[in-house]
C-alpha cells in the first residue's frame, strides 16, 4: 500500500526520488499517496500510457536528466492535482498532442534543454492555470500564431537558446501578465513593430545575443514596467528617436557589441534608476550636446572600444552623479576643454589607446575627485602646467607609451611626477621619444643637461591601434597595479629642479581604488 | 577554491570610524560586483551596499548612506567597507558575498565571507 | 522600498515532512528573488535564484516558484540537515531587501 520501489527513495511515502542509470522504466508500484515523484539521471528512454495513473495526488512531478525521448499522449493522465511538471534535460524532439490535457492545476511546465524542433497552439491549450514555460535551449525556428494563446496567467516565457529567425507581431498579444520574456540567443533579425504592445506587465526582456538589425520606433511603448531590457550583441546600426523615451523603471540596459554609429541628442529618455549604461564594441563615431542629459543617476557610462572622433563640449551635461568614464580604445585626437566641466563626482576616466595629442590646461578643471586617470598609449608629447595640481585624490595615473618629447618643455611635467612617482605605478614608466639621444629614457630621471631647448622634433609616430605593449583594453577591465612603494630617486641626483611646482602632500599612497572601465 | 575572508571587525564606541576588508580568491575578482550584508546579533539579514565590477557603480541602504563608503581595489582582489559615525544599532555581523548575476536571469549572492563582527558600545 | 514578508515566521517539521515557505513582495518584482539557508554561526548559503532555478550543488528536494508577489520556497522532504533559517531576497529594484526570515526546527 505505502510500498516503495526498490529503485527509489521514499521520505514518508509522500516524497519519492528514483535516481540511477539501472532504472529504464518508470518504478513500480508508487506510492499512493505521492506527492513529490523525482526520476533522475536514469537510462528511461520513454514514458508508456498512464505510468502515473495511481498517483493522482502527485503535485510536483521532475523527470529530467534522462535519455527520455519519446512520450505517449497520455502518460499524465489522472495528474489533475499536478502543479509542477518538468521534462528538462531530456531527448524529446516531439511533443504529443494532447500530452498536457487535464493538467488543470499546472502552475510550472519546464522543457528546456531538449531536442524540441515545433510547438503547437494545441500543445498549451489546456494550461490555461501556466504561470511559468521554460522552453529554452531548444531546436525551434518558429513560433506558430496562436500558441500561447491560452495561456492568459503566464508571468515567465523563456524562449531563449533556440533557433528562433522571426517572432510574428501576434504571439504574445494575450499575454497581458507576462513578467518575464526571454529571447535570448536566438536568430532573430527583425521584431516587428507591435509585438510586445500586450506585454503591459512586462518587466525584463532578453533579446541579447541575436542578429537584429532594426528596432521599430514605438517598439516599446506600451511596456512602461520595463526595468531590464537586454539588447547586448545583435547587429542593431541605429536607435529610432524615441526608443526609449518611455522607460522610467528601466535599472538595466545592454547595448554593447552592436553596430550603433550614432547617438541622437535625448535618445535616452528619463530613467532615474538606471546606474550604468554600456555601450562599448559599437561603431559610435561621435557624441552630441546632451546625448544622455536624462541619465541622473548615471554612475558608470562604458563608452570603450568605438570610433569616436568627437566629443561635443556638452555631450556628458547632466551626468552629476558620474563616477566612472570609460573612452578608451577609440579615435580621439583632441578634447574640448569644458567637456568634463559638469562631472563633479567622477572618480575614474579611460582614455587609453587614443590618438590624443595634446590636452587642454583646464580638462580636469571641475573634476576635483578623479582617482584614476588612464592616458597610455595616446600621442601626447607633452601636458600642460599644472593639469594634475588641483587633483588631490589622485592615485593612478598611467602616462606610459606615449611619444614624450623631452626637451626643456618638458621639465615642469617631470618635476611633478618626479614628486608623484606613486601615482605612475611601477609596472610601466612613461619614456622619453624625443629627441634621438633620450629615446628610451624614463622621462623621470632624464638628465636635464642633456635636454635641449624647445625644439620641435618631426618625429611623432603614429602608433597602430594594435600596438606592441599587452593589450588591457577588454571589458571589464582593470589596469593591474603594482605596489606603491615609492621609487628610490633622490632629488640630489638631479641638476636643475628650479622649475618643480611643490604641491602640496595630500598622502594618498594608501588609496586602494584602481578600477579604468 | 573560491573564497571570501573578512577582517576588521572589532569593538569600537559610538561615533567612531572602522574600516572593514574582505580578501577574494579562486575566482577573477575584477569580474564581479561585491556587496555588503550585516546580520544583527539575533536578527535578519540587511543588505548595506554593493559595488559594481570596477568600482564605478555604488549603491547603499538607507540606514547607512552617508556614513558608509564601500570601495575595492581589484589589484589587490580585495574590497573594503569605511565606517564612519558609528551607532549601536550598526552592531552586527558583517558579511562581503559576492554578488553573481548575468542577463539570462541569474541574481544571486552565491559566495559569502564567514563574517566579521562589529560592536559599537560605550 | 520594496518590503519581503515570510510565513511562517517559524515552523517545527519531522524529517521527511514537505514543507512550504512563502515570500510575498510589496510590489511585483518579476522573478527576481533568491532564497537562502543559514544555519547558527554560519553564513548564508544561496539556494534559488530567479525564482525557481536550482543554484549549482544544492540538493534537487529545495524548489521554488512563484513571480511578481507571490513565491513559494518548497522543501519536497525535509532532511536532518535542512533545519535552518531561510531568507527570500529581491533584486528587482535598490535597496535589495531581504525577507525576515523563517526558522525551520524539529518538531
Known amino acids: 500500500y505505502y510500498g516503495c520501489p526498490s529503485e527509489c527513495t521514499c521520505s514518508r511515502a509522500s516524497q519519492v526520488e528514483c535516481t540511477g542509470a539501472r532504472i529504464v522504466a518508470v518504478p513500480t508500484p508508487l506510492p499512493w499517496n505521492a506527492m513529490s515523484l523525482q526520476i533522475l539521471n536514469t537510462h528511461i528512454t520513454e514514458l508508456s500510457e498512464s505510468p502515473f495513473l495511481n498517483i493522482s495526488a502527485l503535485i510536483a512531478l521532475r523527470i529530467e536528466k534522462n535519455e527520455l525521448s519519446h512520450i505517449m499522449p497520455g502518460a499524465f493522465r489522472n495528474l489533475g492535482s499536478l502543479r509542477y511538471l518538468s521534462l528538462a534535460n531530456n531527448k524529446l524532439q516531439v511533443l504529443p498532442i494532447g500530452l498536457f490535457q487535464g493538467l488543470d492545476s499546472l502552475e510550472s511546465l519546464l522543457l528546456s534543454s531538449n531536442q524540441l524542433v515545433q510547438i503547437q497552439p494545441a500543445h498549451f491549450s489546456q494550461c490555461s492555470n501556466l504561470k511559468e514555460l521554460q522552453l529554452h535551449g531548444n531546436h525551434l525556428e518558429y513560433i506558430p500564431d496562436g500558441a500561447f494563446d491560452h495561456l492568459v496567467g503566464l508571468t515567465k516565457l523563456n524562449l531563449g537558446k533556440n533557433s528562433l529567425t522571426h517572432i510574428s507581431p501576434r504571439v504574445f498579444q494575450h499575454l497581458g501578465n507576462l513578467q518575464v520574456l526571454r529571447l535570448y540567443e536566438n536568430r532573430l533579425t527583425d521584431i516587428p513593430m507591435g509585438t510586445f504592445d500586450g506585454l503591459v506587465n512586462l518587466q525584463e526582456l532578453a533579446l541579447q545575443q541575436n542578429q537584429i538589425g532594426l528596432l521599430s520606433p514605438g517598439l516599446f511603448h506600451n511596456n512602461h514596467n520595463l526595468q531590464r531590457l537586454y539588447l547586448s550583441n545583435n547587429h542593431i546600426s541605429q536607435l529610432p528617436p524615441s526608443i526609449f523615451m518611455q522607460l522610467p523603471q528601466l535599472n538595466r540596459l545592454t547595448l554593447f557589441g552592436n553596430s550603433l554609429k550614432e547617438l541622437s541628442p535625448g535618445i535616452f529618455g528619463p530613467m532615474p534608476n538606471l546606474r550604468e549604461l554600456w555601450l562599448y564594441d559599437n561603431h559610435i563615431t561621435s557624441l552630441p550636446d546632451n546625448v544622455f542629459s536624462n541619465l541622473r543617476q548615471l554612475q558608470v557610462l562604458i563608452l570603450s572600444r568605438n570610433q569616436i572622433s568627437f566629443i561635443s563640449p556638452g555631450a556628458f551635461n547632466g551626468l552629476t552623479e558620474l563616477r566612472e568614464l570609460s573612452l578608451h580604445t577609440n579615435a580621439l585626437q583632441d578634447l574640448d576643454g569644458n567637456v568634463f566641466r559638469m562631472l563633479a563626482n567622477l572618480q575614474n576616466i579611460s582614455l587609453q589607446n587614443n590618438r590624443l595629442r595634446q590636452l587642454p590646461g583646464n580638462i580636469f578643471a571641475n573634476v576635483n575627485g578623479l582617482m584614476t586617470i588612464q592616458l597610455q598609449n595616446n600621442q601626447l608629447e607633452n601636458l600642460p602646467l599644472g593639469i594634475f595640481d588641483h587633483l588631490g585624490k589622485l592615485c593612478e595615473l598611467r602616462l606610459y607609451d606615449n611619444p614624450w618629447r623631452c626637451d626643456s618643455d618638458i621639465l615642469p611635467l617631470r618635476n611633478w611626477l618626479l614628486l608623484n612617482q606613486p601615482r605612475l605605478g611601477t609596472d610601466t614608466v612613461p619614456v622619453c621619444f624625443s629627441p634621438a639621444n633620450v629615446r628610451g629614457q624614463s622621462l623621470i630621471i632624464i638628465n636635464v643637461n642633456v635636454a635641449v631647448p624647445s625644439v620641435h622634433v618631426p618625429e611623432v609616430p603614429s602608433y597602430p591601434e594594435t600596438s606592441w605593449y599587452p593589450d588591457t583594453s577588454s571589458y571589464p577591465d582593470t589596469t593591474s597595479i603594482s605596489s606603491t612603494t615609492e621609487l628610490t630617486s633622490p632629488v640630489e641626483d638631479y641638476t636643475d629642479l628650479t622649475t618643480i611646482q611643490v604641491t602640496d602632500d595630500r598622502s594618498v599612497w594608501g588609496m586602494t581604488q584602481a578600477q579604468s572601465g | 577554491q573560491v573564497q571570501l575572508v573578512e577582517s576588521g571587525g572589532d569593538l569600537v564606541t559610538p561615533g567612531g570610524s572602522l574600516r572593514l576588508s574582505c580578501a577574494a580568491s579562486?575566482?577573477?575578482?575584477?569580474?564581479?560586483?561585491m556587496t555588503w550584508i550585516r546580520q544583527a546579533p539575533g536578527k535578519g539579514l540587511e543588505w548595506i551596499s554593493d559595488?559594481?565590477?570596477?568600482?564605478?557603480?555604488?549603491d547603499y541602504a538607507d540606514s547607512v548612506k552617508g556614513r558608509f563608503t564601500i570601495s575595492r581595489d581589484n589589484a589587490k582582489n580585495s574590497l573594503y567597507l569605511q565606517m564612519s559615525s558609528l551607532r549601536a544599532e550598526d552592531t552586527a555581523v558583517y558579511y562581503c558575498?559576492?554578488?553573481?548575476?548575468?542577463?539570462?536571469?541569474?541574481?544571486?549572492?552565491?559566495?559569502w565571507g564567514q563574517g566579521t563582527m562589529v560592536t559599537v558600545s560605550s | 522600498e520594496i518590503v519581503l514578508t515570510q510565513s511562517p515566521s517559524s515552523l517545527s517539521a519531522s524529517v521527511g515532512d514537505r514543507v512550504t515557505i512563502k515570500c510575498r513582495a510589496s510590489?511585483?518584482?518579476?522573478?527576481?528573488l533568491a532564497w537562502y539557508q543559514q544555519k547558527p554561526g554560519k553564513a548564508p548559503k544561496l539556494l534559488i535564484y530567479?525564482?525557481?532555478s536550482l543554484e549549482s550543488g544544492v540538493p534537487s528536494g529545495f524548489s521554488g516558484s512563484g513571480s511578481g508577489t507571490d513565491f513559494t520556497l518548497t522543501i519536497s522532504s525535509l532532511q536532518p540537515e535542512d533545519f535552518a533559517t531561510y531568507y527570500c531576497?529581491?533584486?528587482?529594484?535598490?535597496?535589495?531587501?531581504f525577507g525576515p526570515g523563517t526558522k525551520v526546527d524539529i518538531k
Open positions: 558575498a559576492r554578488y553573481n548575476w548575468n542577463d539570462r536571469g541569474y541574481d544571486g549572492f552565491d559566495i
Open positions: 579562486g575566482f577573477t575578482f575584477s569580474d564581479y560586483y
Open positions: 559595488i559594481g565590477s570596477s568600482g564605478g557603480s555604488v
Open positions: 510590489q511585483g518584482i518579476s522573478s527576481a
Open positions: 530567479d525564482a525557481s
Open positions: 531576497q529581491q533584486f528587482n529594484s535598490y535597496p535589495h531587501t
